[in-house]
């Protein structure tokens, strides 16, 4: 019996087609992805093959103005329109709190939404009961397939799930649910979830009875053969893991942003054992036409976005200096504003020991593309912010050793004075450079804001200590020559859309007046 699994993950609000790098589509003839194009390909496969499941491994939420405006209603609407069979909860599904998940998505989705390792407690338990499930048995033709969901246990550090959801260890939570499916005579089981490729592989290895793992979170690109676009494969598709009980378990992921549709064909024997598995992600490029009906619906929903982008978010009473003449040479108040917004967006998970889990921000000055003039009645709009941060990136959370941070700051000024983009703007950091010294030895003082303290203060950076830092995904991926970050980071979790982070902060503050205050000397 053959099953076709179509899968997406980390779509992050890319409802419209995008450019090849998943930013705003400029030249339509070279654009990719989007739900209208995805629908065309999905329908093509559904028509050609008998047993097809369309699955999503989480993080539909967060990433473009679509999510900012529609807050998840767009996810439910278009996933329903594409007729998804199941979805696993990702960490970003909690970005607007539990209410922001329940109302727009859980109550509106026609398909089951899954996670076995999230347990509700207190008053939330009854409110959310039945709205998401640990598993679902799906009929496919004359057979049944069990889908069991999981979500990153780091979600409380990455999003806003509140205090009434407990995120258990994935493997510990999955095993009893898989065992339950086995007792229901379900012998074909897919683990669908959002914890990253390393955890996906562990699930394949450790959870008895899981036949296939469909993952997300790490934006992993797997491919067999010559890859069709810019993404470099992290391994073959499917990636085969030998389980502890000796089975060959295929593990798949489909990069991110709706650029690819994962396509996996699995052959099962009559006892539900995987006999063979093969496939590849399908690049959703312009050779696949956008479905006209879905496209028309997208255009209808788009109208509200255009109206939103010109509305006032808040006011500034000072000039927001985002000029390259400032931000690539010295501390600039636009850099301070953005870093303060980045930290504010990550205020969560305080306890008796820590006032917050992260206090530091770094931001390449070259990523700040425009100033905002306060003389326009002080008005700040989404449109203004899109000019400052035009690349459609995210502000991510990484863990780095102090020694890596020191290298990053040396790199920041290794060729100072040439108006290059690597000059770092900061938050929660005080750095002193001596530019008379030779490159690689110019950082003379580097103090960082403590997190394990009741009164935050600046302490000298310790080389062997592990620090959490918020930074643009561009830097986490080694951009602007920050190879040491990419090579030495100990953990990387994708965060929220950059413009959204700053716009939320400005809306919250109402009136802003960031200063140049001696963070960089």
């Amino acid at each position: 019996w053959e099953l076709t699994i179509l899968h997406t993950n980390d779509v992050h609000s890319r409802l419209e087609q995008t450019s090849e790098d998943s930013s705003k589509c400029v030249n339509a003839s070279r654009c990719m992805g989007g739900v209208a194009r995805l629908f065309t390909k999905v329908q093509q496969i559904r028509r050609a093959e008998p047993n097809v499941l369309l699955l999503d491994a989480g993080d539909q939420y967060q990433g473009t103005i679509w999510f900012t405006v529609y807050k998840g209603a767009e996810v439910a609407h278009f996933m329903n329109a594409l007729r998804y069979d199941a979805m696993a909860l990702g960490n970003h599904e909690f970005d607007n709190g539990v209410e922001g998940l329940i109302e727009p998505l859980l109550k509106e989705a026609k398909f089951p939404i899954l996670s076995a390792n999230i347990k509700a407690k207190g008053p939330l338990a009854s409110q959310i009961s039945g709205l998401y499930l640990p598993y679902k048995v799906l009929p496919v033709g004359d057979e049944v397939v069990g889908i069991v969901g999981y979500t990153s246990k780091e979600t409380p550090f990455l999003s806003n799930p509140g205090t009434n959801l407990v995120f258990e260890d994935e493997i510990t939570a999955l095993q009893p649910e898989v065992d339950k499916l086995k007792t229901l005579n379900v012998n074909k089981i897919i683990a669908l979830g959002h914890s990253g490729f390393e955890t996906d592989k562990l699930i394949a290895q450790k959870v008895r009875g899981v036949d296939v793992v469909v993952g997300g979170h790490s934006n992993t690109f797997l491919y067999t053969g010559n890859p069709p676009s810019k993404e470099v494969p992290a391994g073959k598709y499917p990636f085969i893991v030998t389980s502890d009980d000796g089975r060959k378990v295929p593990v798949v992921q489909a990069y991110a942003f709706g650029k690819y549709l994962g396509y996996l064909k699995i052959e099962f024997d009559e006892r539900g054992n995987v006999i063979s598995s093969h496939g590849n992600p399908i690049l959703l490029n312009s050779s696949i036409p956008e479905d006209p009906s879905i496209k028309a619906d997208i255009n209808k929903w788009r109208i509200k976005l255009d109206n939103y982008s010109t509305q006032e978010l808040g006011k500034t009473i000072v000039y927001l200096d985002g000029s390259s003449q400032s931000c690539r040479f010295r501390e600039c108040n636009m850099g301070n504003l953005i870093c303060d917004a980045m930290i504010n967006n990550n205020l969560r998970h305080a306890d008796e020991m820590f006032w917050n889990h992260v206090s530091m921000c770094i931001l390449n000055g070259g990523g700040i593309r425009s100033p905002i003039d306060e003389r326009n009645n002080g008005t700040i709009t989404w449109e203004n912010l899109a000019a400052v941060l035009p690349f459609g990136g995210t502000f991510d959370l990484v863990q780095l050793k102090g020694s890596t941070l020191k290298k990053a700051f040396e790199h920041s000024v290794h060729r100072y004075g040439q108006s290059t983009g690597e000059f770092l703007q900061v938050g929660g950091i005080h750095v002193v450079y001596d530019l008379s010294r030779k490159p690689g030895d110019r950082v003379v003082k580097l103090d960082v804001l403590c997190t394990k303290c009741r009164v935050p203060s600046y302490d000298p950076l310790k080389m062997d200590e592990i620090y959490k830092v918020i930074l643009p995904n561009f830097l986490a991926n080694g951009g602007d020559g920050f190879q040491m970050i990419k090579d030495e980071l100990l953990r990387h979790d994708s965060g929220d859309q950059d413009i959204n982070v700053v716009s939320t902060y400005i809306s919250k503050m109402k009136v802003i007046y960031p200063a140049v205050e001696g963070r960089i000397k």
Partner: antibody, heavy 121, light 107 residues
Amino acid sequence: QVQLVESGGGVVQPGRSLRLSCAASGFTFSNYGMHWVRQAPGKGLEWVAVILYDGSNKYYPDSVKGRFTISRDNSKNTLYLQMNSLRAEDTAVYYCARGGSSWYPDSFDIWGQGTMVTVSS
Amino acid sequence: DIQMTQSPSSLSASVGDRVTITCRASQGISSWLAWYQQKPEKAPKSLIYAASSLQSGVPSRFSGSGSGTDFTLTISSLQPEDFATYYCQQYNSYPLTFGGGTKVEIK
């Protein structure tokens, strides 16, 4: 082979009740949404009810809502339509039809031969 | 509710003719449209689903096209056994609705 056989039709007075059955064979009944569709004499097709594969959801058009109830017994591979408060305009051939395997609306790939219901005093 | 309008309501054609029947939805239904054939005193038979996919066992002279609101059923070369009534049906949303039917008669 795949087959649907309806039964239970007949002549009934207005205001009375009737229960139709549909016996399924040749496929995994519990995996499919099942529908009732009717056709008044000399008229077109009208959808009457659906019950999803697991019985979790049922949908009806306004014309029968509150009067007709669809149900299924997966252990007996049987679909039912309980029709109460029958009216003259309910007179039709009632077909049982197989839908899809999910919770989305679907088309009908297999049809029964139909059973005639006549509502007349 | 989504209204389905079929045209023509009847047509006369000869064996070998190319026949086209149209179906219009009152609102967009993407490609969630099916076509059925019904002969007198018989149950309907599924021909096409998802606007253009041929049900297994249906001759290739039948084809469907369209998306959104406008759909077409084409019989490329009418055969004697094709004289029947044809119905379209939307399954975009409940309540499911049928077109009024097109009766194809012998000229």
